[in-house]
């Protein structure tokens, strides 16, 4: 459910939202770290209806969700958490 992407592409997000998205609507979360052509960290939420939302990394809810997912990743998360590098 949580993915970290390292990419040489420029920024993917044109507009960011801080609107809370309930866990039941989230398919996966992409984290695009700062650097490599984009000066800011980006978080992309893929919703189960196939739509994509760029989330403000400063939004309290997404920070909390990522922390919970990280904590659960070693034991009880029903959907695997994984990191993937994209060249």
């Amino acid at each position: 459910v949580l993915e970290v992407y390292y990419t040489s592409l420029r920024c993917r997000c044109v507009q960011e939202s801080s609107v809370f998205i309930p866990r039941r609507f989230i398919d996966r979360i992409q984290i695009l770290p700062r650097g490599n052509g984009c000066p800011r960290k980006e978080i992309i939420v893929w919703k189960k209806n196939k739509s994509i939302v760029c989330v403000d990394p400063q939004a309290e809810w997404i920070q909390r969700m990522m922390e919970v997912l990280r904590k659960r990743s070693s034991s009880t998360l029903p959907v695997p958490v994984f990191k993937r590098k994209i060249p």
Epitope: V19, F20, I21, P22, R23, R24, F25, K48, N49, E60, W61, R64, M65, V68
Partner: antibody, heavy 120, light 107 residues
Framework: EVQLVESGGGLVQPGGSLRLSCAAS????????MSWVRQAPGKGLEWVAE????????NYAPSLKDRFTISRDNAKNSLYLQMNSLRAEDTAVYYC?????????????WGQGTTVTVSS | DIQMTQSPSSLSASVGDRVTITCKVS??????VAWYQQKPGKAPKLLIY???YRYTGVPSRFSGSGSGTDFTFTISSLQPEDIATYYC?????????FGGGTKLEIK
């Protein structure tokens, strides 16, 4: 003005069936997740089921999923709840509610409710 | 299922009082909690969503706070028209669940 109007409630014997309807007006019905919520006499609120705009994703309260079926007809701006094998404990006011992404998928508009009484 | 433990189940307060209702959740629901007001014979009305966002048209005396497992709903100055039952609800994951309700009465 948003309006949700439930109908189809009434008195039914245990083991019987009912189909509730919710007619929506004043909204682009095909955009919204919709839910059914019920309230037994003198009791609290109990979520029954929800359905996404395309009817491709449906969730139920675990204790009800074998007997209740939620559906919708976007062309008719209508939401339905088929209730089978009814029991006395299903006696309640049944509300339909819209879930809006503006309010983060909470139930921001509710109908006035329709009463279902299961009794012999 | 996620359990919502709401307290108190009833309370009596005077006009102008500050009223606080709490909701404890059995597991982390982030900020996925809403608060509803229901008057006798009427459908519930959404007051607060995402723990602290006031819904359109809701008076500023109503507020909410919290995240994770502990949530609070406050009426800063109780008005006669606030007499109702208030419910918390988690919408983070299914099945959606409600608290047992808090019946608010005027002293």
């Amino acid at each position: 003005e948003v309006q949700l109007v439930e109908s189809g409630g009434g008195l039914v014997q245990p083991g019987g069936s009912l189909r509730l309807s919710c007619a929506a007006s004043g909204i682009d019905f095909s955009r919204y997740w919709m839910s059914w919520v019920r309230q037994a006499p003198g009791k609290g609120l109990e979520w029954v089921a929800e359905i996404n705009p395309e009817a491709s994703s449906i969730n139920y309260a675990p204790s009800l999923k074998d007997r209740f079926t939620i559906s919708r007809d976007n062309a008719k701006n209508s939401l339905y709840l088929q209730m089978n094998s009814l029991r006395a404990e299903d006696t309640a006011v049944y509300y339909c509610a819209r879930q809006d992404d503006y309010s983060h998928y909470t139930m921001d508009y509710w109908g006035q409710g329709t009463t279902v009484t299961v009794s012999s | 299922d996620i359990q919502m433990t709401q307290s108190p189940s009833s309370l009596s307060a005077s006009v102008g009082d500050r009223v606080t209702i709490t909701c404890k959740v059995s597991q982390d629901v982030n900020t996925g909690v809403a608060w509803y007001q229901q008057k006798p014979g009427k459908a519930p009305k959404l007051l607060i969503y995402s723990a602290s966002y006031r819904y359109t048209g809701v008076p500023s005396r109503f507020s909410g706070s919290g995240s994770g497992t502990d949530f609070t709903f406050t009426i800063s100055s109780l008005q006669p028209e606030d007499i109702a039952t208030y419910y918390c609800q988690q919408y983070y994951s299914t099945p959606l669940t409600f608290g047992g309700g808090t019946k608010l009465e005027i002293k």
